[in-house]
């Protein structure tokens, strides 16, 4: 039930995938991650105007109630719809190990 | 990977389940739903301070990057972690029918 992908606020202003470059220090990972030393973090950023990429019925309800009661009910929020896995080389007591994280990098976005 | 449930902002200020009473008119459903005439909409509302109910690794990253770049990266957002199904009696071309919606009422909440 994913609604319109046309952003009424102008190009790039609505909920979409962004890439933010971050070091291990930025992420607070320097003490337990060996590699990569820098991560291209993909995340969901942007506004969720009426019915834009509405994830489900709940998002549609939220839009309606936000319009009626903006001080009580927040607008839908731009969050990951799915994720891309990422591999980290981690420090361990005995050396290093490879670990795959399924919930680290956003793959695409919707409003909920 | 759901982190702390202690809200540092004070009781009830952080991400949690709220109930908002809404009529069919409020929801824009009056033309296609017969019953219920009023819905107790459960939704997720509240702030997501550092590591509060962090849904996953992505939420933890978002918290770290929001602290570093608050103008670029938004704080995690309070959204449903799961849903309760709800039944609507809908108007159809031939009369009425029962329809179960799995994604209408939030059951519990997390930050993402």
């Amino acid at each position: 039930a994913r609604n319109g992908d046309h952003c009424p606020l102008g190009p790039g202003r609505c909920c979409r995938l962004h890439t933010v470059r971050a070091s291990l220090e930025d992420l607070g990972w320097a003490d337990w991650v060996l590699s990569p030393r820098e991560v291209q973090v993909t995340m969901c950023i942007g506004a969720c105007p009426s019915q834009f990429r509405a994830a489900n019925m709940h998002a549609q309800i939220k839009t309606s109630l936000h319009r009626l009661k903006p001080d009580t009910v927040p607008a839908p929020c731009c969050v990951p719809a799915s994720y891309n896995p990422m591999v980290l080389i981690q420090k361990t007591d005995t050396g290093v190990s490879l670990q795959t994280y399924d919930d680290l990098l956003a793959k695409d976005c919707h409003c909920i | 990977a759901r982190n702390g449930d202690h809200c540092p902002l004070g009781p009830g200020r952080c991400c949690r389940l709220h109930t908002v009473r809404a009529s069919l008119e409020d929801l824009g459903w009056a033309d296609w739903v017969l019953s219920p005439r009023e819905v107790q909409v459960t939704m997720c509302i509240g702030a997501c301070p550092s590591q509060f109910r962090a849904a996953n690794m992505h939420a933890q990253i978002k918290t770290s990057l929001h602290r570093l770049k608050p103008d670029t990266v938004p704080a995690p957002c309070c959204v449903p972690a799961s849903y309760n199904p709800m039944v609507l009696i809908q108007k159809t071309d031939t009369g009425v029918s029962l329809q179960t919606y799995d994604d209408l009422l939030a059951k519990d909440c997390h930050c993402i």
């Epitope: - | 019953s35 219920p36 309760n84 199904p85 039944v87 009696i89």
Partner: nanobody, 122 residues
Framework: QLQLVESGGGLVQPGGSLRLSCAAS????????IGWFRQAPGKGPEAVSC????????YYSDSVKGRFTISRDNAKNTVYLQMNSLKPEDTAVYYC???????????????WGQGTQVTVSS
């Protein structure tokens, strides 16, 4: 405390019939909307039919319309679901639930009892 007990399930061949019963104890059924729900393995609950408390109106999901009939017997404090022309996709655990006083249907799918297993297979 509102307690509902379902019975009448079983194994039946495609095209066959069953009648499920939902018996109440601790309260009078005719004051409440009663709904039948089902849950197939690995799927969410689905409302199948309900009967309103106010005027006895009956409602059905599109998947069972014309095949299932809901009725109530106030003297026996029981609601029935007559299931005809059963199909393999009707296989599920069937539950009944009571809605709020004065409602047309139990709206929120909440907690329920043990249910009764219906299996349609040749």
């Amino acid at each position: 405390q509102l307690q509902l007990v379902e019975s009448g399930g079983g194994l039946v061949q495609p095209g066959g019939s069953l009648r499920l019963s939902c018996a109440a104890s601790g309260f009078t059924l005719d004051y409440y909307a009663i709904g039948w729900f089902r849950q197939a393995p690995g799927k969410g609950p689905e409302a199948v039919s309900c009967i309103s408390s106010s005027d006895g109106s009956t409602y059905y999901s599109d998947s069972v319309k014309g095949r299932f009939t809901i009725s109530r017997d106030n003297a026996k404090n029981t609601v029935y679901l007559q299931m005809n022309s059963l199909k393999p996709e009707d296989t599920a655990v069937y539950y009944c639930a009571a809605g709020e006083y004065g409602s047309d249907c139990p709206v929120q799918v909440g907690s329920w009892g043990q249910g009764t297993q219906v299996t349609v297979s040749s």
